[in-house]
Amino acid sequence: FGISGRHSITVTTVASAGNIGEDGILSCTFEPDIKLSDIVIQWLKEGVLGLVHEFKEGKDELSEQDEMFRGRTAVFADQVIVGNASLRLKNVQLTDAGTYKCYIITSKGKGNANLEYKTGAFSMPEVNV
C-alpha cells in the first residue's frame, strides 16, 4: 500500500518472498524526482533498531545501518532517478522475514509504504507432461 496527500508522494511496495541462502528483492517504487541528489531512500524493519539501508545524495550511507544487514544490501543506484527504490538483499536468512518500510524523501515531499517479506525454502513446482 502507499500514502499520498499534501506534501506527500506516492510510494508503492509489493509483498514478496525470499529463498533462504539466495538473493532476494524487496520491491518499492515512488514518484521520481529530476535530481538524484534530492532523493533519500531509507529501508527500515520492524524489530530492528538501525536502518536496513540508506541511500542519499546519490550514494549509500552506511553509518546508521543495522549490523544484521551489513554487507547484504544494495539499491539499484542507476534506477533510483526513475523511481525505483527496490532493495537487493543478499544471502536471505530466515530472520529477514517481517515487516519492512520503504521511506522516501524527495524535493516533492515524503512518502512511505510497508511490505511483508516472507522467507523460506521455496522451490519451483515440477511440471510433468
Partner: antibody, heavy 116, light 113 residues
Framework: QVQLVQSGAEVKKPGSSVKVSCKAS????????ITWVRQAPGQGLEWIGG????????KYAQKFQGRVTITADESTSTAYMELSSLRSEDTAVYYC?????????WGQGTLVTVSS | DIVMTQSPDSLAVSLGERATINCKSS????????????LAWYQQKPGQPPKLLIY???TRESGVPDRFSGSGSGTDFTLTISSLQAEDVAVYYC?????????FGQGTKVEIK
Amino acid sequence: QVQLVQSGAEVKKPGSSVKVSCKASGYSFISYAITWVRQAPGQGLEWIGGINPIFGTAKYAQKFQGRVTITADESTSTAYMELSSLRSEDTAVYYCAKGQALIQHWGQGTLVTVSS
Amino acid sequence: DIVMTQSPDSLAVSLGERATINCKSSQSVLSSSNNKNYLAWYQQKPGQPPKLLIYWASTRESGVPDRFSGSGSGTDFTLTISSLQAEDVAVYYCQQYYSTPLAFGQGTKVEIK
C-alpha cells in the same frame, strides 16, 4: 538544522521513577533511531538503549533491562526514557541523541539527581 | 560486548605541541564487508554534550579543524591533535559503533602544560 530539546532537571527520591523527554526537530523523526546515553558526575559515557520510532522497537543495555523503558511519540516527534527503582548511583546527566550508531547530534542533557 | 580502553587517562601538553590519545577495542571493529572501521572520536567540554570529531576512524566531521586526525584499524586507534590550541582543552572519548551495545572509552582529559 537538527535539534534535540530535552526536559528540565529533576530531583527524585530513591525507589521512585523519572521520565525524561526529548523533542526532535529539523529532520524526519521516524527515519532514525533515538539513543539514550548517561554520564554520572565526573564519569564517562554509558549507553542506556535506543528506539526505532517508526516501529517502536527498543533495545536496552543489559545493565538497565527491566528498569528502563524507551518510547517514542511520532505525532509530536518526541522520545521518552523512563527509569524506575532509582538509586543514588543513577544521579547523572541523561542525553538523547539522533541515531543508533554514529552520534552526530545530541540533546543538551537532563540532570537527574537521586537523593533522599 | 566490545570494551573500549583509552590511554592515557590524562595528558598535559604545551600550546602548539602534539597531543596523542590511544584507544583499544577488545575485538576488531573493522567490517570485512565494507572495509570500514566503526570507530568515532568525540570531544566534550564542561557542561556540554559530546561533539563528534572523527568517524570511520579517520574521516573528519565537517567543520572540525584539520589539526585533528584519526588513524588506526582493527583494534588499535589514535587521535592526534597536531598543534594544541587553548580551545582544545576537553575530555576526548573514542566510541565503537560496530555493534550494540555501543561502547565508549573511559575518556582522556587534555590540559595545557
